[in-house]
């Protein structure tokens, strides 16, 4: 029941993952890995943060957002078909078995030969906010309405329903704020 995101060969892919630090600068270690989340940490780690900074990264993988504010969304530069697969975002909240694990499926499509259509700006009407709740059973999807001024009170990936990376970029460009605490 991984949430699915898409990008085209040659584009940058965007895999959203967010949390709200308990206090500004009070960061939680996060890792991103290629492959589903294992029991501890991430498998095949591509990027890692600690309580202060990004302390490990590999080429083409970076955090474009402000990770000090909890935006730990992963950008993969210039994707190829080999980048398809499941990625794990793990937020390592201190405590007893407190980690939050999110498996995100990246699907890479061959580059379009024809010019891309005009990007949909009024995407809140076309794509109402969806929250995909993941557990051991099938994904349960519910509509939460349009995007602005949403306040989620749980750690979650942002825009789980936005399957296309460009739509996720639109979300960031729109200035919609999601507060997760």
């Amino acid at each position: 029941s991984e949430v699915e995101y898409r990008a085209e060969v040659g584009q940058n892919a965007y895999l959203p993952c967010f949390y709200t630090p308990a206090a500004p600068g009070n960061l939680v270690p996060v890792c991103w890995g290629k492959g589903a989340c294992p029991v501890f940490e991430c498998g095949n780690v591509v990027l890692r943060t600690d309580e202060r900074d990004v302390n490990y990264w590999t080429s083409r993988y970076w955090l474009n957002g402000d990770f000090r504010k909890g935006d730990v969304s992963l950008t993969i530069e210039n994707v190829t078909l080999a980048d398809s697969g499941i990625y794990c975002c793990r937020i390592q909240i201190p405590g007893i078995m407190n980690d939050e694990k999110f498996n995100l499926k990246l699907v890479i499509k061959p580059a379009k030969v024809t010019p891309a259509p005009t990007r949909q700006r009024d995407f809140t009407a076309a794509f109402p906010r969806m929250l995909t709740t993941r557990g051991h059973g099938p994904a349960e999807t519910q509509t939460l309405g349009s995007l602005p001024d949403i306040n989620l009170t749980q750690i979650s990936t942002l825009a789980n329903e936005l399957r296309d990376s460009r739509l996720a970029n639109d979300l960031r460009d729109s200035g919609a704020t999601i507060r997760i605490g």
Partner: antibody, heavy 123, light 107 residues
């Protein structure tokens, strides 16, 4: 040379407590997840608990988390397992193990193990 | 919990034989599988991790394969020091779980 040496095992009555220790040497202890695995006499391996590098994240077998507490002291290169309200079924050899780790991997399998310490719970 | 089932439980073989031990997971664990070897009175030794990667210092006669729910450990030509008990362990789901073990004995 990597070494893990467990101590603190012994005979204890049901309902009693024990604190196991694992002294680590030959590696940078604070860089590694650490784990306790147990093995009842003549039986297979059972994961008990694990702890992350700085001790802020802990993981337990559900049935044990109310009675067992894993902790570490990186300054002393030591791992601990506090066991309370012990039962006969806790009788086992308890192994301390190091989670295999480098920056691009995950510490979900164990590359070095101690020799084990026997805990016997009996009246 | 993810159940790990090894087969056979015990196996008799001779030096030079090729043997295969299998491990089945009750659900998809991708390639998150490890194999250990344990000799009587000793602690386990890491052989293979991530289903097929040989641990440092492990002889090349050992090999691991599989993904999803079906895995195997093969010893291409048994040596006297290979007679031991072998355990698989999954590290996809909490709790970490081990197979019940396969005891490899001399025929």
């Amino acid at each position: 040379e990597v070494q893990l040496v467990e101590s603190g095992g012994g005979l204890v009555k049901p309902g009693g407590s024990l604190r196991l220790s694992c002294a680590a040497s030959g590696f940078t202890f604070s860089d590694y997840y650490m784990t306790w695995v147990r093995q009842a006499p003549g039986k297979g391996l059972e994961w008990v608990a694990s702890i992350n590098y700085d001790g802020r994240n802990t993981y337990y077998l559900d049935s044990l988390k109310s009675r067992f507490t894993i902790s570490r002291d990186n300054a002393k290169n030591s791992l601990y397992l506090q066991m309370n309200s012990l039962r006969a079924e806790d009788t086992a050899v308890y192994y301390c193990a190091r989670g295999y780790y480098y920056y691009g991997s995950s510490p979900n399998y164990f590359d070095y193990w101690g020799q084990g310490t026997l805990v016997t719970v009996s009246s | 919990d993810i159940q790990m089932t090894q087969s056979p439980s015990s196996l008799s073989a001779s030096v030079g034989d090729r043997v295969t031990i299998t491990c089945r997971a009750s659900e998809n664990i991708y390639s998150y599988l490890t194999w250990y070897q344990q000799k009587p009175g000793k602690s386990p030794k890491l052989l293979v991790y991530n289903a097929k990667t040989l641990a440092e210092g492990v002889p090349s006669r050992f090999s691991g394969s599989g993904s999803g729910t079906q895995f195997s450990l093969t010893i291409s030509s048994l040596q006297p020091e290979d007679f031991a008990t072998y355990y698989c362990q999954q590290h996809y789901g909490t709790p970490l779980t081990f197979g019940q073990g396969t005891k490899l004995e001399i025929k």
